[in-house]
């Protein structure tokens, strides 16, 4: 997802199908201000950026909107009116997934039931992960709709659970970027609770002198 | 098994025409997902990804061909096409239809035609 | 566009050997970056999907890496039925863009 041109590193993320944003870091460029300007069509004129992202009061990126028809990012980095990086590219390659929204479980004996609402476009991936004390590891379970079911749990114990959205690899490419995780919830006997103990790390074996 | 069959290439005039087939076969062209794409292999064995046009309709040129050319379908024929204008020499080539790999556009190419060679000369 | 340089362009080899071929790309490009063969009188194969993955069909000697700008595709213990020009393709840049192809010849 970066990608290089005289000395500017480049990183493209196209969050939910809604807003590009470009970021770089330009280390030939310490103390410019780069522009950044764009199109979504090779025959419309380029347009300025008109919300940069600053950092240490320098421009590093760009967000722009966009619409599910943009297909095509056209843009250009510059210092002054001299180009210092050009490129067009497939939006979707560096799709971003929003949290899941509405987030409900619901148990039954011993399993889970997650939902939530579906994403407006397809070609994803939910997936929720939970794990108990005991477990050192996340277990993992994902379904095509934002409707996983986990089972074989005991309800006994305590378990924590998040869950994301993922672009699927067949559809956009293998160089997505999956969703920030929702917020951990923990669920024991049913009900929430404000959290699980932590999970039991193995003892270190005590070396012989 | 998608199979996919050009049609419509010989020997055309500089300034000229020509309008290129491609029957498809095993697959149908409107799946939804699914693009469909011209790429030309000039003499050299230089290969140039011309455009593709979707399961949609939607199409897409390479912009240093966009002006001169035009892909379209006929749903019912499951055929696309590739109309092309103002031949020049240099666009002597053979040129295949390809399938995209995945359901999207911008991937690889995983099923190809046989070619069809376009000589453009006087 | 991306710009995909190829090295190799010529390559003799003995059956069994181990061959590599390099793809550079003028940006980076992440992993999408697919390889194909083409052998005399044939239209081209896809060989490699995204860098390194497989294509059902395709012998196991051939494989493939890299991410970036810096790519390879390996045939590992080459047959005589592997003479054939290869092309490297990227994918996320517009337009779509090929090597220019290396010429693998087996003495």
């Known amino acids: 997802q970066v990608a290089t041109g005289e000395g500017l590193q480049i990183q493209i993320m196209y969050f939910n199908l809604e807003t590009v944003q470009v970021t770089w870091n330009a280390s030939h460029y310490p103390r410019s201000n780069l522009s950044f300007h764009y199109k979504f069509s090779r025959d419309e004129a380029y347009d300025q950026c008109t919300v940069y992202i600053l950092q240490e009061g320098h421009t590093s990126g760009c967000l722009l909107d966009a619409e599910q028809q943009d297909d095509i990012l056209y843009f250009s980095i510059r210092n002054g009116t001299h180009p210092v990086f050009t490129a067009s590219r497939w939006i979707f390659y560096y799709l971003k997934p929003s949290s899941p929204k509405q987030v409900s479980f619901s148990w039954h004996q011993d399993a889970v039931t997650l939902t939530c609402s579906d994403l407006s476009y397809r070609g994803l991936l939910y997936e929720v992960q939970y794990r108990s004390p005991f477990d050192t590891e996340w277990q993992s379970k994902q379904e095509n709709t934002c409707n996983v079911t986990v089972e074989d749990l005991d309800a006994e114990k305590c378990y924590a659970f998040r869950a994301r959205v993922k672009a699927m690899e067949d559809a956009y490419g293998p160089d997505t970027y999956p969703s920030d995780w929702s917020e951990v919830t923990c669920w024991q006997r049913g009900e929430t609770r404000d959290s699980c103990p932590e999970p039991r790390t193995p003892p270190k074996p005590k070396l012989s002198k | 098994q998608v199979q996919l069959v050009e049609s419509g290439g010989g020997l055309v005039k500089p300034g000229g025409s020509l309008r290129l087939s491609c029957a498809a076969s095993g697959f149908s062209i409107t799946t939804s997902g699914y693009y469909w794409t011209w790429i030309r292999q000039f003499p050299g064995k230089g290969l140039e990804w011309m455009g593709y046009i979707g399961y949609n309709s939607k199409t897409y040129y390479n912009p240093a061909l966009k002006s001169r050319i035009t892909i379209s379908r006929d749903n019912a024929k499951n055929s696309l096409y590739l109309q092309m204008n103002s031949l020049r020499a240099e666009d002597t080539a053979v040129y295949y239809c390809a399938r995209s790999l995945y359901g999207g556009y911008k991937d690889a190419f995983d099923s190809w035609g046989q070619g069809t060679l376009v000589t453009v000369s006087s | 566009e991306i710009v995909l340089t190829q090295s190799p362009d010529f390559q003799s080899v003995t059956p069994k050997e181990k061959v590599t071929i390099t793809c550079r790309a003028s940006q980076s490009i992440g992993t999408s970056l697919h390889w194909y063969q083409q052998k005399p009188d044939q239209s081209p194969k896809l060989l490699i999907k995204f860098a390194s993955r497989s294509i059902s069909g395709v012998p196991s000697r051939f494989s493939g890496s890299g991410s970036g700008t810096d790519f390879t595709l390996t045939i590992n213990s080459l047959e005589a039925e592997d003479a054939a020009t290869y092309y490297c393709?990227?994918?996320?840049?517009?337009?779509?863009?090929f090597g220019q192809g290396t010429k693998l010849e087996i003495k």
């Open positions: 393709q990227q994918s996320p840049g517009f337009p779509p863009t």
